[in-house]
């Protein structure tokens, strides 16, 4: 699997987009994980409905949502608030019992935030009880990392 | 803002069949569920079925399973729950709920009377 | 098929007081649990999805918690708005399921 970069800046909204085939994937639940080191476990992050017909709900974990567009195949990953420590390797998957797809490699990538000069007053965030469809999502920029180019750096 | 207006009051026949409308104003009618809950009388809530309009998808709980239809028309953005074979158990209020974000039932109709008597 | 049981059936209690109403599923459901609120002659209103999220609009005084089999629907000062029957639904598994309620009603 190539690895596609998505960049955010910092305190805004990025969105992940994890095209897939429809009907390989038929009926399978989706998962977002974090790769952790280069050879290590991919720690689950947000999982999509329990019930598949219900894939479009959004799910969330703490600033992380899902939703899946399980006729269009594409998954949606929303990481709002986006912090330096958000940035690193991670996996768009297809679950099938215990077992799981990759679907997407991705590297996130965070950028400063160029308005992180101002006060904090002039930024507004959603709070945890108004509608995420009023939130402003930035959108993210993403390209595939070139052959040779490693998304962790090297280990000593 | 998303409203879901259904049809008016219904009076039948133990046998008969019923056929409720809801009609979703405001925001995609395709890509969400619409599902129907109904009240007895004094009674709690009942899950009855889903659908899914834009592909038509339904689910419905094993109780109403071969006597509800539930049907969505996109061009009229309505959805239709049709009970047949009624008896007096089945007077209630029936409420169509859809999803809008998180959740399943974020938004609900104002719910239809059904009596069934002779 | 998942069962939900509220308890208690009935709570009797003054504005400003502090309510908690319990919901225990038969199994576990995760946090795949919503709440919700039903006045006499109306349809439910979402307070909390997701065990504990509160829907938009939903004043602050209404909190959830738990996971797994055991819930919590915390109203922190009733306000007279407040009684009313509150119900729990969980959909993490077909058929879609309610709790009984729990009536909460003025002492």
């Known amino acids: 699997h190539n690895t596609t970069v998505f960049q955010g800046v910092a305190g805004q909204s990025l969105q992940v987009s994890c095209p897939y085939d429809s009907m390989k994937h038929w009926g399978r639940r989706k998962a977002w994980c974090r790769q952790l080191g280069e050879k290590g476990p991919c720690q689950r992050v947000v999982s999509t409905h329990n019930l598949w017909l219900l894939s479009f709900l959004r799910r969330w974990n703490g600033s992380t949502a899902i939703t899946d567009d399980t006729l269009g195949g594409t998954l949606t990953i929303t990481l709002r608030n986006l912090q330096p420590h958000d940035a690193g390797l991670y996996q768009c998957q297809s679950l099938h019992g215990s077992e799981a797809d990759t679907l997407r490699k991705v590297l996130v990538e965070v950028l400063a935030d160029p308005l992180d000069h101002r006060d904090a007053g002039d930024l507004w965030f959603p709070g945890e009880s108004e509608s995420f469809e009023d939130a402003h999502v930035e959108h993210s920029i993403s390209r595939s990392l070139l052959e040779g180019e490693i998304p962790f750096p090297p280990t000593s | 803002q998303v409203q879901l207006v259904q049809s008016g009051a219904e009076v039948k026949k133990p046998g008969s069949s019923v056929k409720v409308s809801c009609k979703a104003s405001g925001g995609t009618f395709a890509q969400y569920a619409i599902s129907w809950v109904r009240q007895a009388p004094g009674q709690g809530l009942e899950w009855m079925g889903v659908i899914i309009p834009d592909s038509g998808t339904a689910n419905y709980a094993q109780k109403f399973q071969g006597r509800v239809t539930i049907t969505a028309d996109e061009s009229t953005s309505t959805a239709y729950m049709e009970l047949s074979s009624l008896r007096s158990e089945d007077t209630a209020v029936y409420y169509c709920?859809?999803?809008?974000?998180?959740?399943?039932?974020?938004?609900w109709g104002q719910g239809t009377l059904v009596t069934v008597s002779s | 098929e998942i069962v939900l049981t509220q308890s208690p059936a009935t709570l009797s209690l003054s504005p400003g007081e502090r309510a908690t109403l319990s919901c225990r599923a038969s199994?576990?459901?995760?946090?795949?649990l919503a709440w919700f609120q039903q006045k006499p002659g109306q349809a439910p209103r979402l307070l909390i999805y997701d065990a504990s999220n509160r829907a938009t609009g939903i004043p602050a005084r209404f909190s959830g918690s738990g996971s797994g089999t055991d819930f919590t629907l915390t109203i922190s000062s009733l306000e007279p708005e407040d009684f009313a029957v509150y119900y729990c639904?969980?959909?993490?598994?077909?058929?879609?399921?309610f709790g009984g309620g729990t009536k909460v009603e003025i002492k």
């Open positions: 639904q969980q959909d993490y598994e077909w058929p879609i399921t």
């Open positions: 709920a859809r999803t809008q974000e998180n959740t399943i039932f974020d938004i």
């Open positions: 199994q576990s459901v995760s946090s795949y």
